[in-house]
Interface confidence: medium
């Protein structure tokens, strides 16, 4: 029985050239988290494995930093970074939990004006 829930930062906006933290939190379960995958559409960005620690995909090494915690920091944002991001928690005995974040990368002035309309 999967009792857990994933809380995410939801829909977020950030400005071009800046950085953003993608954060997910698994709650309401005592399951062991054995690995967390971060994916953008069908591309694997990073893995945090309970035994091995962090692995960042080579194509994202320059712009992706692990943490804080099980989160992921995206740096030097471009408009092409706009899209869906998924945190996938592998747990035992529950199985797989998936959280979704939508990131919109905006030109600097637009991001400043749009910040107050972020969905938490």
């Amino acid at each position: 029985m999967m009792t857990g829930t994933i809380e995410t930062t939801g829909n977020i906006s950030a400005e071009k050239g800046g950085s953003i933290i993608l954060q997910c939190h698994l709650s309401s379960t005592t399951a062991q988290v054995t690995q967390v995958n971060w994916e953008q559409q069908d591309q694997l960005l990073a893995i945090c494995n309970a035994d091995l620690g962090w692995h960042i995909s080579p194509s994202f090494k320059d712009r992706v930093a692990p943490g804080p915690g099980l989160g992921l920091t995206l740096q030097s944002l471009t408009v092409n970074d706009t899209g869906e991001y998924f945190c996938i928690y592998h747990t035992y005995p529950d199985g797989t939990y998936t959280g979704r974040i939508f990131l919109e990368v905006l030109e600097s002035s637009v991001a400043e004006h749009g910040a107050r309309f972020q969905i938490p």
């Epitope: 999967m2 062991q32 054995t34 690995q35 995958n37 069908d42 694997l44 893995i47 494995n49 309970a50 035994d51 091995l52 592998h90 035992y92 005995p93 529950d94 199985g95 797989t96 998936t98």
Partner: antibody, heavy 119, light 107 residues
Framework: EVQLVESGGGLVQPGGSLRLSCAAS????????MSWVRQAPGKGLEWVAT????????YYPDSVKGRFTISRDNAKNTLYLQMNSLRAEDTAVYYC????????????WGQGTLVTVSS | AIQMTQSPSSLSASVGDRVTITCQAS??????LSWYQQKPGKAPKLLIY???TLASGVPSRFSGSGSGTDFTLTISSLQPDDFATYYC?????????FGGGTKVEIK
Amino acid sequence: EVQLVESGGGLVQPGGSLRLSCAASGFTFSSYTMSWVRQAPGKGLEWVATISSGGSYTYYPDSVKGRFTISRDNAKNTLYLQMNSLRAEDTAVYYCTRWLLSLYAMDYWGQGTLVTVSS
Amino acid sequence: AIQMTQSPSSLSASVGDRVTITCQASQNINVWLSWYQQKPGKAPKLLIYKASTLASGVPSRFSGSGSGTDFTLTISSLQPDDFATYYCQQGQTYPFTFGGGTKVEIK
């Protein structure tokens, strides 16, 4: 080339024990989650056990929990399955598999080793 | 445990035929479904993962689709090498479970 070679199968009496081994080569063994899957003669596939890359976490279905133990020696690139209190229904070909958490699938399988539990 | 129901359990087809195999999960498994091919006396081989992504080296005549509870494996033009048994497997929840298999035979 990724290779998984199982050994240790054979005939054992009900209640007996057996230890299967799986020698891995062609990849960095210590970086991968590994599993055992079995197939009874003429039947389908059944997941038996999984162990995390460093060996810290092990997982079993209820059908073998408490009787089977999965372990690994990363220095020897070898996966093990210790099977105790064997029953007739454990008769099967046992496959060693590499489990990819980034694919949510088993991407490489060994050729299998047959375990027969009979008196 | 999540039950995986495959249909049909067997089918007869000719070279060049389009073949469709379905797999139904007893509860939502998102896209965490894989398909394997097994030939007699051989180990299973991964064909498709995450419901629709082709594994490395698998011919493009194989395709997968679906999410939630209903999934499909399609072979667009059956080749002599494709006569085998096909299994689906869910990776959503422990224990990982397989479908009962679909045997594809020569008509």
